[in-house]
Each structure stands twice: as C-alpha cells, then as structure tokens.
C-alpha cells in the first residue's frame, strides 16, 4: 500500500491525523467496526491538545472513543499504553456501575457532555469518532 498523504473527503486533518465525526449513534462494537472498515480506528486520545480538538468538534454529546476494558485491563484500540498515557476521566470515574440492570458493568469509554470521560454500557447507541494517521500505509493500492 501507499502512504496516505491527505485526509479523505469529509475527514478533518489535525496534527498528522485524520478524524471523522459521526452524526448518528451506534453501539461501541459497531462503531469500532465502522472505523476499521474505513481503515481507521476509534479515536485514541494521547494528549490534552488532542482532547481539546476532539471536544471542540463533538460538542456536548456522549461520544465513543477507542478505549475499553471488556477483557479486564483498560486498552486503547491501537495498542497505545493505557497506564502511561493521557487520561481525562470525570471525578469518580471509571466506576464499572452495575445498577443499569443490563448485565455486566460498564466496559467502554466515552466523552461526556463536558468532554471528560466516563465508562458506560457498550451497547448504548452513542456517536463516535474515527481516527487514522496520515503517515501510515494505506490499504488501498497505489494509483498507476
């Protein structure tokens, strides 16, 4: 594949990454799959600067990111290390709340209305953000 040099149509470029902001809602797994099919991943927040950029674009709306603990440990979908990485949880979060009665706790992270993070039931139909890095090789063959 060739190296991607500019963002696809309807994606927003920022700091050598491309972002796509949904306007509909999906469960976390469906959102994750949507991004993968776009040769991207759910957004991975690695800095306060990136947090502010995403927050500006999504507004005060619950929005999935690429962070989950469905297998126990918190993991970013692109392999970024959770322990040493940027975190922006709301106070008292994550809390793995069981009181929703839907089964299990809360295993998927989302931006809340003030941008800070919360863990919630992964089946909730929230908006989502896809991200892909400009410097990574595209899956598409080069144009001849």
């Amino acid at each position: 594949g060739s190296e991607r040099t500019c963002c696809p149509v309807n994606w927003v470029e920022h700091e050598r990454s491309c972002y796509w902001f949904s306007r509909s809602g999906k469960a976390w797994a469906d959102a994750d799959n949507y991004c993968r099919l776009e040769d991207a991943h759910l957004v991975v927040v690695t800095s306060w600067e990136e947090q502010k950029f995403v927050q500006h674009h999504i507004g005060p709306v619950n929005t999935w990111m690429g962070l989950h603990d469905q297998n126990g440990p918190w993991k970013w979908v692109d392999g970024t290390d959770y322990e040493t990485g940027f975190k922006n949880w709301r106070p008292e979060q994550p809390d793995d709340w069981y009181g929703h009665g839907l089964g299990g706790g809360e295993d998927c992270a989302h931006f809340t209305d003030d941008g800070r993070w919360n863990d919630d039931v992964c089946q909730r139909p929230y908006r989502w953000v896809c991200e892909t890095e400009l410097d990574k090789a595209s899956q598409e063959p080069p144009l001849l």
Partner: antibody
C-alpha cells in the same frame, strides 16, 4: 508489572476481627474495581466483595454482609477487608483480585478457631 | 443468585488429548463469563474473559465459546503443565458466582 500482595491474615477466635490488606502496584489503581475472593480448605472459589475505583459502589456476598467491610485508599494503592464477628466457616485463603480477575495476589490465610 | 454448574467435576486425560469442559448458567448471562486455572497451593490465573477472549500471555491452545447459558473451555492439546483445576465465573450480576471446578488429572 502488575503486583498484588495480601497481608493481615492469621489465627483468630470465633467472634474476633481481622483486617486484611492488599498492596497494589504496576497499574493505575483508581481505574479499576477490586475484589476479595476466598477459598476454604479443599473447596472451590467464593466471591466475597467488590469495590469500584473511587469507592462509590460496594458489593458483598450474603454470607459476609453486615460483618465484612471493603474499602480502599487510592493514594496508597491499597485495598482492605475489615472482617468482624468472624465464624469458623470464614476460614479460608483470601485473595485480592483486580477487575474481573485479570490479576490475583498470592493469598493470605485466615483461620478462625477456638 | 445465578448458579454456575460445571461438568464434569473431574476428568482423566493424557498428554496430547483434546479436553472440553462445560459450564452452564442458571439464567442468561450473555457473554459475561470468565475461565480460570488453578494449580495446588497457587492463586487462580485468568485464561479467558468475555466467554471467548484469550487473556494476554495465555497460549492459544486454550479457547472459550458460548453465550447465554452454555459455555465451553477447550484445551486443544493437553500438556503436562495443564493438569490443574478449572473454574468458570459469571460477572453478569452480583453476587458474582463460580462453578464448582473441574479437576483435570493425568490418565
């Protein structure tokens, strides 16, 4: 490297008290729920109690409700289990475990006997 | 409370055998099921969570499947280090509950 180290076990008479501790390291302690699980001699595993990352939610097995209290100190990366009104049937190895059991400590022996 | 029933309680097998352990929940628990391995005098070790997701560092000879009420743990080719007791556990709702265990012994 994730490490969980339990301490505080020992021999106590029925009706007595013990406080177990679990020292955690190698991960962001406040991001994870923590649990106590016990195993009586020659028996299987029994979940005892869980606590959410910031202590908002606490859950107990019926067998220990009203007698045991789970707590944590995120500043000290420590989990606790205060055990009061101990009974002979509380005799077991007590393990602390992270989240839904991704990591376990080595266990601490609690023996309740007269 | 949700009851978890494992079968068999014990089994004898030889090195190289394919071993299957089943776990049945008394009600639908979706995929909120974990499997653990425990050797004598040691703490349990997590093998699988979310019914089928292999934990980091666990060899691929272990696999899990199932959803709802019926689940299986399979060891594709039993090795000497796999002789141990295996437990399933539901975390769908509190109180969390374990199966009674399946002891895998050398034939």
């Amino acid at each position: 490297e994730v490490q969980l180290v339990e301490s505080g076990g020992g021999l106590v008479k029925p009706g007595g008290s013990l406080r177990l501790s679990c020292a955690a390291s190698g991960f962001t302690f406040s991001s994870y729920s923590m649990n106590w699980v016990r195993q009586a001699p020659g028996k299987g595993l029994e979940w005892v109690s869980s606590i959410s990352g910031s202590s908002t939610y606490k859950y107990y097995a019926d067998s220990v409700k009203g007698r045991f209290t789970i707590s944590r100190d995120n500043a000290k990366n420590s989990l606790y289990l205060q055990m009061n009104s101990l009974r002979t049937e509380d005799t077991a190895v007590y393990y602390c475990a992270r989240d839904r059991g991704s990591y376990w400590g080595q266990g601490t022996q609690v023996t309740v006997s007269s | 409370d949700i009851q978890m029933t494992q079968s068999p309680s014990s089994l004898s097998a030889s090195v190289g055998d394919r071993v299957t352990i089943t776990c049945r929940a008394s009600q639908d628990i979706s995929n909120y099921l974990a499997w653990f391995q425990q050797k004598p005098g040691k703490a349990p070790k997590s093998l699988i969570s979310a019914a089928s997701s292999l934990q980091s560092g666990v060899p691929s000879k272990f696999s899990g499947s199932g959803s709802g009420t019926d689940f299986t743990l399979t060891i594709s080719s039993l090795q000497p280090e796999d002789f141990a007791t295996y437990y399933c556990q539901q975390y769908h709702s509190y109180p969390w509950t374990f199966g009674q265990g399946t002891k895998v012994e050398i034939n």
